[in-house]
């Protein structure tokens, strides 16, 4: 079932082959350079989303610069298909499942002084599921309540203040988020959960709910990078990817992902026993992408040099701001008991095959489906 | 079987130091952490500290930093409390119970280590 | 650190009535622990993580609460149940333990 979901992986949720960038993976090194000691938490396939739907709007060297940024290079017939695939996948992501809970969207918050073309919001309505909505951005406070109430109305609440302050100037901004909980196909014991020490660095523990489960894992030690992979699935078809580094080697790790680092770990998984303790944590990213994709070559539109003649027939228009946010909950929930009483484990003795993994320091996770749903570094749970 | 087996009792006099020690059975302490609490007569508990023998990281109350050094032979599976500059403050019974992953943390005691500072 | 107060410092009950032992912390807690203790013996696990009894603890324990605030309740007191009671946190070091709640039997 692991090797179907290799084959199936569309990294980075780009539906198209030819790519000259890892777009998920230049993302999130850029993120990490910009805040080396911070948590990290993003979607790939939501951002690639918005920034394909943003695509539809674009032209010349703007559309191309998106498109290139994500590692896609298209052919006239192939970016259709790629709005296609897009749409598809949404339809897939936003179907009600039992016990997963997924809230993904987009939106676009324009100027009262914006005509947008109807082309594009019909476009952006029928491939991207997306709203547009008329903002008055001089009263700024007020401009900042709508798109939040919005956010958090949209995820039931999940996210909340998605903004934290807002330029009046603003013409356009961009919306994108998305919120994950879903539950692990056989649950962790709450009564196995106990607070633990995790090192923030070598100095530096804090303690944290540590749930643990024995059981049988998708595993694997990888030496070239020097660190130990776990494959954790949920109900359905997502799993949950948790890297730990071995000490010391966090940087080496995070140099080292690809999509050809991922589709080999996917690929080498094998079944192995292991008393697994992971911290119950929730984790949330919150990222203003116009700062962060210039150095991934996509900055024509968030400049004077844009072009998004696509959108709106006024000549100056750009993206303001591109705002993202992802939060994931990680806790013991279930759709099966685990096998596990009162107590945490039997003795060792009886369980001498049995490897123990502690995600007690720094860690990475990816949650995968047939894309990268989210890819994160938990620095502090 | 899980058990810990602590030293007999200790008669000091004060400036003097001494160490005691927890023997545990039934399992390895190398896979483990050990805590050790303080209680003076007729008083509460008070949590001394803890050594995690995976990585040797200790971490103690700062009012027993420098009065107590938590410590351990793994080979013979035992855990070693030593309390230094004694006063007649420290006269109480010291206990070590049992921490770590695979287990409750203070789900196992030691019987106790009765010392008296006494000139 | 985090210092826990425990209320009442003493108290007796009747065989039978319910007793409520309750702790505050200074700071919120992931989660709190409790303990018992008699005379010449030492402290035994009681209640872990909260809400949990651990092994062979009776039924008519029980734990609650969150963040600053939780209790041990004895839902019918009986002889047995005479001993002292300490609360414990582990949520952030030092580790620190209430002062104790020595209930007797009326």
């Known amino acids: 079932e692991m090797k179907k979901r290799v084959e199936d992986l569309h990294v980075g949720a780009t539906v198209a082959p030819s790519s000259r960038r890892d777009f998920t993976f230049d993302l999130y090194r850029a993120l990490a350079s910009a805040a080396p000691s911070q948590s990290i938490f993003f979607s790939p396939v939501s951002i690639s989303m918005s920034l394909a739907m943003l695509s539809l709007g674009a032209g010349s060297s703007t559309k191309m610069q998106i498109l290139e940024g994500l590692g896609l290079n298209l052919q006239k017939s192939s970016e259709k298909e790629l709005h296609r695939g897009f749409q598809q996948l949404l339809q897939e992501l936003n179907q009600p499942r039992d016990g997963f809970q997924l809230s993904l969207g987009n939106a676009l918050f324009t100027d009262l002084v914006v005509d947008l073309q109807d082309t594009f919001v019909s476009a952006m309505k029928t491939l991207y599921l997306a709203d547009t909505f008329p903002t008055n951005f001089r009263d700024s406070a007020g401009a900042m309540k709508q798109i939040n109430d919005y956010v958090a109305k949209q995820t039931k609440g999940k996210i909340v203040d998605l903004l934290k302050n807002l330029d009046s100037n603003a013409v356009v901004i961009m919306v994108n988020y998305i919120f994950f909980k879903a539950k692990w196909e056989t649950s962790f014991n709450h009564k196995g959960t106990q607070e633990q020490d995790f090192y923030v660095t070598s100095e530096t523990v804090v303690r944290v709910p540590m749930m643990s489960r024995e059981d049988q894992y998708h595993y694997l030690l990888d030496r070239n990078l020097s660190c130990r992979v776990v494959g954790v699935p949920y109900q359905g078809n997502a799993t949950a990817l948790f890297i730990l580094p071995s000490e010391g080697k966090m940087q080496q790790v995070e140099n080292g992902l690809s999509e050809k680092t991922l589709r080999k770990w996917l690929k080498m998984f094998k079944k192995r026993q292991l008393e697994l303790y992971l911290p119950k944590f929730s984790i949330e990213g919150s990222y203003q992408l116009e700062k962060v994709l210039p150095s991934l070559g996509i900055s024509n539109v968030f400049t004077s040099h844009a072009d998004l003649s696509g959108i709106s027939n006024h000549s100056n228009i750009q993206v303001s701001e591109m705002v993202h946010k992802a939060v994931v909950e990680v806790d013991e929930s279930g759709t099966r008991a685990a096998a596990a009483t009162g107590t945490i484990f039997t003795f060792r003795s009886a369980r001498l095959n049995s490897q123990r993994l502690v995600f007690n320091r720094p860690f990475l996770m990816f949650i995968v489906d047939n894309n990268i749903l989210f890819l994160g570094k938990v620095n502090r749970p | 079987e899980v058990q810990l087996q602590q030293s007999g009792a200790e008669l000091v006099k004060p400036g003097a130091s001494v160490k005691l020690s927890c023997t545990a059975s039934?399992?390895?302490?190398?896979?483990?952490?050990m805590h050790w609490v303080k209680q003076r007569p007729e008083q509460g508990l008070e949590w001394i500290g803890r050594i995690d023998y995976v990585n040797g990281n200790t971490k103690y109350d700062p009012k027993f930093q420098g009065k107590a050094t938590i410590t351990g032979d793994t080979s013979s599976n035992t855990a070693y409390l030593q309390l230094s500059s004694l006063t007649s403050e420290d006269t109480a019974v010291y206990y070590c119970?049992?921490?770590?992953?695979?287990?409750?943390?203070?789900?196992?005691w030691g019987q106790g280590t009765l010392v008296t500072v006494s000139a | 650190q985090i210092v826990l107060t425990q209320s009442p410092a003493i108290m007796s009950a009747s065989p039978g009535e319910k007793v409520t032992i309750t702790c505050s912390a200074t700071s919120s807690l992931i989660y709190m622990h409790w303990f018992q203790q008699k005379p010449g013996s030492s402290p035994e696990l009681w209640i872990y993580s909260t809400s949990n009894l651990a092994s062979g603890v009776p039924a008519r324990f029980s734990g609650s609460g969150s963040g600053t605030s939780y209790s041990l309740t004895i839902s019918r007191m009986e002889a047995e149940d005479a001993a002292t009671y300490y609360c414990?946190?582990?949520?952030?070091?030092?580790?620190?333990f209430g002062s104790g709640t020595k209930l007797e039997i009326k």
């Open positions: 414990q946190q582990r949520s952030s070091y030092p580790f620190t």
């Open positions: 039934g399992f390895d302490i190398k896979d483990t952490f």
């Open positions: 119970a049992r921490g770590g992953y695979d287990v409750r943390e203070f789900a196992y």
